[in-house]
């Protein structure tokens, strides 16, 4: 058993049928010695008397808010949560496996640049009685500071019969140098509590591996005289690290017909312009990627050919 | 501690092309190592990230773009002095700081070259003959060093009398390649910045 926060405790259980559970001793936070009784949640049934209460915690029915009273007055509370260990592995019931980029990916994180700011998000089908708390650091043995905000509900989607909820959090490394070569990964730890179930999820990454630039901005077409060709131009996104000559991007320019089946023409360039043939009803899209370290491509920025 | 804006003209910067070749070569070599050594811990998540140049060179600091010198977090106290007569400095306006930057890159390349050659000698003794260093990568390191053209003491190749532990050597190869790829990215960024300035 360990303390998650004041008056909230996590009991770790080896979770299998007929498991013996864990013996837990609760102590009433009071100078009083006599006439103390204990109850669980809203029940008025007295579980025991005295300054301490010993319980055998086996299942969720044994978890909850234990309260000690004296003469009708509440003295203190202890909330017991359960953390299930199923055959050597901590349970992952609360969050959905996003399966990208690999199985058992519960937290996904992205950064728009090298400033040390990043966003993580996760999915659940649970809509109520759910709380998250996020901590982060650079490295784990001698951790350096990363500050995270509060996790917020960022999207709701319908997936078949189920509703899916996306939560996200923004974090910022306290002293980040965009040009630094990372040798210690960023660690992100999410505590999740659903009713009386506690779970924790972690992700470890280098900022360089989670870079996904914003799409190029100011995408424009300039028709070339007496030609079906157009000059496409764009700019680096505002959110990208500067100077751009040091943090350079490479670009992919795509001409896509109206129908998805039509052949796509693609050009790769390090410049911020390209000459392409504009077909009728086609659209031109441009996306960006770090020129020197192949992390994710940005989303597409698009303009119609007409 | 930083790169000045007054640097060589774009057409006068022969190192850019070599640094791009270097990044391509080390990336290909790392990919090959990850595929060949699939039963060894060779992914970024599995290896310890070690920098063999730590406390010996200060490339990131010496080559910091002027725009980032206002960032407190980028100003590291490590100071290293270097020789300053490289041929990539194709302009008389080249400052001392830029020379320091390029000589730091040269020292990095020299250290990695020695490590890779020593490692290759061990790998050639492996009866499994599982993996060797790409000669193209070694050649590209050499080309960039020649383009930088710094006079510096030659570091003798390390020779070891004891029987090599091939498992450990292959893991060290992975660690070295990951670190060298990161340094090659920094070198490419620096060359691109100098070329544009």
């Amino acid at each position: 058993i360990w303390e998650l926060k004041k008056d909230v405790y996590v009991v770790e259980l080896d979770w299998y049928p007929d498991a013996p559970g864990e013996m837990v001793v609760l102590t009433c936070d009071t100078p009083e010695e006599d006439g103390i009784t204990w109850t669980l949640d809203q029940s008025s049934e007295v579980l025991g008397s005295g300054k301490t209460l010993t319980i055998q915690v086996k299942e969720f029915g044994d978890a909850g808010q234990y309260t000690c009273h004296k003469g009708g007055e509440v003295l203190s509370h202890s909330l017991l949560l359960l953390h299930k260990k199923e055959d050597g592995i901590w349970s992952t019931d609360i969050l959905k496996d996003q399966k990208e980029p690999k199985n058992k990916t519960f937290l996904r994180c992205e950064a728009k640049n090298y400033s040390g700011r990043f966003t993580c998000w996760w999915l659940t089908t649970i809509s109520t009685d759910l709380t998250f708390s996020v901590k982060s650091s650079r490295g784990s043995s001698d951790p350096q500071g990363v500050t995270c905000g509060a996790a917020t509900l960022s999207a709701e989607r319908v997936r078949g019969d189920n509703k899916e909820y996306e939560y996200s959090v923004e974090c910022q490394e306290d002293s980040a140098c965009p040009a630094a070569e990372e040798s210690l990964p960023i660690e992100v730890m999410v505590d999740a509590v659903h009713k009386l179930k506690y779970e924790n999820y972690t992700s470890s990454f280098f900022i360089r591996d989670i870079i996904k630039p914003d799409p190029p901005k100011n995408l424009q077409l300039k028709p070339l005289k007496n030609s079906r060709q157009v000059e496409v131009s764009w700019e680096y996104p505002d959110t990208w690290s500067t100077p751009h000559s040091y943090f350079s991007l490479t670009f992919c320019v795509q001409v896509q017909g109206k129908s998805k089946r039509e052949k796509k023409d693609r050009v790769f360039t390090d410049k911020t312009s390209a000459t392409v043939i504009c077909r009728k009803n086609a659209s031109i899209s441009v996306r960006a990627q770090d020129r020197y370290y192949s992390s994710s491509w940005s989303e597409w920025a698009s303009v119609p050919c007409s | 501690r930083n790169l000045p804006v007054a640097t060589p003209d774009p057409g006068m910067f022969p190192c850019l092309h070599h640094s791009q070749n270097l990044l391509r070569a080390v990336s290909n070599m790392l990919q090959k190592a990850r595929q060949t050594l699939e039963f060894y811990p060779c992914t970024s998540e599995e290896i310890d990230h070690e920098d063999i140049t730590k406390d010996k060179t200060s490339t990131v600091e010496a080559c910091l773009p002027l725009e980032l010198t206002k960032n407190e977090s980028c100003l590291n106290s490590r100071e290293t002095s270097f020789i300053t007569n490289g041929s990539c400095l194709a302009s008389r306006k080249t400052s001392f700081m830029m020379a320091l930057c390029l000589s730091s890159i040269y020292e990095d390349l020299k250290m990695y070259q020695v490590e890779f050659k020593t490692m290759n000698a061990k790998l050639l003794m492996d009866p499994k003959r599982q993996i060797f260093l790409d000669q193209n990568m070694l050649a590209v390191i050499d080309e960039l060093m020649q383009a930088l053209n710094f006079n510096s003491e030659t570091v003798p190749q390390k020779s070891s009398l004891e029987e090599p532990d091939f498992y450990k050597t292959k893991i060290k190869l992975c660690i070295l390649l990951h670190a060298f790829r990161i340094r090659a990215v920094t070198i490419d960024r620096v060359m691109s910045y100098l070329n544009a300035s």
Partner: antibody, heavy 115, light 112 residues
Framework: QVQLVQSGGGVVQPGRSLRLSCAAS????????MHWVRQAPGKGLEWVAF????????YYADSVKGRFTISRDNSKNTLYLQMKSLRAEDTAVYYC????????WGQGTMVTVSS | SYVLTQPPSVSGTPGQRVTISCSGG????????VKWYQQLPGTAPKLLIY???QRPSGVPDRFSGSKSGTSASLAITGVQAEDEADYYC????????????FGTGTKVTVLG
């Protein structure tokens, strides 16, 4: 006393279907994940499928994906394996088993796929 | 399709120590826990070892398990006639959990 009692096995022709049941007692069935494991005559153990405690997630071996469906009825304390498009290589003793560091197995039920 | 490899058979005389190996990889035994089962003819498997080296109550202390790197082993110190059975190791793969990975199985024969 934890008990898993299996039923539903038998002889079936290739291409046909069969449903196995596993009735649980002596524990809170709705709190635990469950597996199906099979063993062909004279062969080793092969994992078939897994279902989470609440039925929210199901996992299958590649050899049965798309043909077998694992399900549970927590109100009846029963685990099921619906087997469709049966093949000769599905002939085996099928076991249900609880998930956890200490596990409990059913007695096994024989499924024979033969024309 | 078995990724956990065991010797097909091992044998020993009563009182001898016999060991069964179970060889896997970094993504299974290398990063997950191992169990060992005993299966007597015509019966369901019985758990002998969980969590690499833990013995459930009721299992004789002559059975012990260990794990090192990507391999695990089961030792029977002072093998007895009633130990003649098939033995299976079981682990998970970190990418496909909770799918069970079973070893190929080892037939233990007690001679004499």
């Amino acid at each position: 006393q934890v008990q898993l009692v299996q039923s539903g096995g038998g002889v079936v022709q290739p291409g046909r279907s069969l449903r196995l049941s596993c009735a649980a007692s002596g524990f809170t069935f709705s709190s635990y994940g469950m597996h199906w494991v099979r063993q062909a005559p004279g062969k080793g153990l092969e994992w078939v499928a897994f279902i989470r405690y609440d039925g929210s997630n199901k996992y299958y071996a590649d050899s049965v994906k798309g043909r077998f469906t694992i399900s549970r009825d927590n109100s009846k304390n029963t685990l099921y394996l619906q087997m469709k498009s049966l093949r000769a290589e599905d002939t085996a003793v099928y076991y249900c088993k609880t998930h956890g560091s200490h596990d409990n197995w059913g007695q096994g039920t024989m499924v024979t796929v033969s024309s | 399709s078995y990724v956990l490899t065991q010797p097909p058979s091992v044998s020993g005389t009563p009182g001898q120590r016999v060991t069964i190996s179970c060889s896997g990889g970094r993504s299974n035994i290398g990063s997950e826990t191992v169990k060992w089962y005993q299966q007597l003819p015509g019966t369901a498997p019985k758990l002998l070892i969980y969590g690499n080296d833990q013995r459930p109550s009721g299992v004789p202390d002559r059975f012990s398990g260990s794990k090192s790197g990507t391999s695990a082993s089961l030792a029977i110190t002072g093998v007895q006639a009633e130990d003649e059975a098939d033995y299976y190791c079981q682990s998970y793969d970190r990418g496909t959990h909770p799918a069970l990975l079973f070893g190929t199985g080892t037939k233990v024969t007690v001679l004499g």
